[in-house]
Interface confidence: medium
């Protein structure tokens, strides 16, 4: 912490500019007022302080607003947001679109800080749901932001707002995560033709029940392989043959190469032989013929 | 990759002028301060000041204020140092370099190919 | 102005060797230090930045240590690709300043 000195004769800040980055840290402490740093913050980041002195003007702040900073000033703060501690950011209300952007434009092209997670936690507490204009805010710069959340937090994403959402900003999302999404995502798209209606969910099929699939694969849609890869495994299995080279067209000979993966592995398992032969792909390991194939599961939900 | 690039010399007369350039690629030019350093032979480097390229905003050290003077072009990503009244002091290699900042450091990460000024009649 | 010292401008090594260069600062500076390596004809390039950080690529031979008025590289296995000039630099306060740098030479 900066001692407490007297600011020498004629060296008062009349106003913040760039003549304070000659400062020593003790001329900063003593001779910038707090309140004309707060009223004028949006010029500290246009003035290349180093961040010795930065934690000066941080510290200025914090006694000036020892319960949380005003938005006004949060707006403004530039780089002096990367100073800030996630115990700091918590005493904040942002409320603001325009203010979180202007803090993730500064951490723009770093990994999401745990400052940077606890501002948008902050925010998105403090607006109750996750709505489209901030969905669109935080996939532009964190695209991985939507697959941080739990199955939880997602459940508080209205549909409206999965418009937002691109297909790399689901790159990383697991199953779970797709189960909530899903749904939503079917709900926001359920007027769209055919065609863009299967462009649009195609990246959240990963929580596809198979009723949908089976629905899909009606429309002639061509889902490739990656796609079908990253479908529900207990979706894929009540699938028949038929479904299957329905839903990936001509797609259908890229099974051959991913049969000793899930979910194909297992889905070959279930298919009888000689239905596997009929694509003629040489797909192997399906239920010999003269076999009885017993659903145990659905002899147990009728017990 | 991020790259700043610089003419390899230049020879000027006592008491004339120079305008050095620094080219930067591969980056958001606006996004970064760029520096000026100044090194003779045998001797340490001197930081002559910067320049911030989104406004054009300028500072220098003090024993460089009436040497040089600092401009930015941001359409062409291209910083500029005029040197003035140039003696056999000046002859030196000027190098432009950026400046990078976060949470608790700062540094120059790239730096340019340097300019290497001879004064000479 | 702070100024940056680095007392020893050459320093004989041979490979394999640990060798530590030196340099202090007139006043304090926290950890706001980087250090940069010259090899001649070339740009510097940073090796070490906030005193004992490590930039991106640098092999982990180099290391940089100190706080306050006395910091230290060391470079612990002393490679022929490493015989330049290195010098240490101050970003506490404005303005910037550079110790004059010491010259790495083969015995």
């Known amino acids: 912490e900066v001692e407490k000195t007297a600011c020498p004769s004629g060296k008062k800040a009349r106003e913040i500019d760039e003549s304070l980055i000659f400062y020593k840290k003790w001329e900063l402490e003593a001779c910038v007022d707090a309140a004309l740093l707060a009223t004028q913050m949006d010029r500290v980041n246009a003035i290349p302080f180093t961040y010795e002195q930065l934690d000066v003007l941080k510290h200025k702040l914090d006694e000036l607003y020892p319960q949380g900073y005003p938005e006004s000033v949060i707006q403004h703060l530039g780089y002096l947001f990367l100073k800030m501690s996630p115990e700091d950011i918590r005493k904040w209300n942002v409320t603001s679109l325009e203010t979180l952007k202007a803090l993730l434009e500064v951490n723009k092209g770093h990994e999401m800080s745990p400052q940077v997670a606890t501002l948008i936690d902050r925010f998105v507490k403090g607006r109750g749901q996750l709505d489209k204009d901030t969905l669109d805010t935080l996939t532009a710069f964190y695209p991985g932001y939507l697959c941080s959340l739990s199955p939880e937090e997602l459940s508080s994403v209205p549909p409206s707002s999965i418009w937002a959402v691109r297909p790399q900003d689901l790159d990383t999302c697991d199953p779970r995560q797709l189960d909530v999404l899903y749904p939503k995502a079917r709900l926001a798209f359920q007027n769209m033709n055919g065609s863009e209606y299967f462009v649009k969910i195609q990246s959240f099929l990963g929580g596809a029940p198979t009723e949908d699939l089976k629905a899909l694969s009606q429309q002639n849609v061509s889902m490739d392989l990656a796609t079908f890869m990253k479908l529900r495994t207990d979706a894929v299995l009540p699938l028949t043959v038929a479904e299957v080279q329905k839903l990936l067209g001509p797609h259908v000979e890229g099974l051959k190469a991913e049969e000793r993966h899930r979910p194909v592995r297992d889905w070959i398992l279930r298919q009888r032989q000689d239905d596997l032969d009929t694509l003629g792909l040489g797909l192997q390991g399906g239920i010999p013929n003269g076999y009885l194939v017993l659903d145990l599961s659905m002899q147990e939900a009728l017990s | 990759q991020v790259q700043l690039q610089q003419p390899g010399t230049e020879l000027v007369k006592p008491g004339a002028s120079v305008k050095l350039s620094c080219k930067a690629s591969g980056y958001t030019f606006t996004s970064y301060w760029m520096h000026w350093v100044k090194q003779r032979p045998g001797q340490g480097l001197e930081w002559i000041g910067h320049?911030?390229?989104?406004?054009?905003?300028?500072n220098y050290n003090e024993k460089f204020k009436s040497k040089a003077t600092l401009t930015v072009d941001k359409s062409s990503s291209t910083a500029y140092m005029q040197l003035s009244s140039l003696t056999s002091e000046d002859s030196a290699v000027y190098y432009c370099?950026?400046?990078?900042?976060?949470?608790?450091?700062?540094?120059?990460?790239?730096w340019g190919t340097g300019t290497t000024v001879t004064v000479s009649s | 102005d702070i100024v940056m010292t680095q007392s020893q401008k050459f320093m004989s090594t041979t490979v394999g060797d640990r060798v530590s260069i030196i340099c202090k600062a007139s006043?304090?500076?926290?950890?706001?230090v980087a250090w940069c390596q010259q090899k001649p004809g070339q740009s510097p390039k940073l090796l070490i930045y906030?005193?004992?950080n490590r930039y991106t690529g640098v092999p982990d031979r180099f290391t940089g240590s100190g706080s306050g008025t006395d910091f230290t590289l060391t470079i612990s296995n002393m490679q022929s690709e490493d015989l330049a000039d290195y010098f240490c630099q101050q970003y506490s306060s404005y303005p910037l300043t550079f110790a004059g740098g010491t010259k790495l030479e083969i015995k």
């Open positions: 006043q304090n500076v926290g950890s706001a």
């Open positions: 370099a950026r400046w990078v900042r976060g949470s608790n450091y700062e540094y120059f990460d790239v």
């Open positions: 320049s911030n390229p989104s406004n054009g905003g300028t």
């Open positions: 906030s005193a004992s």
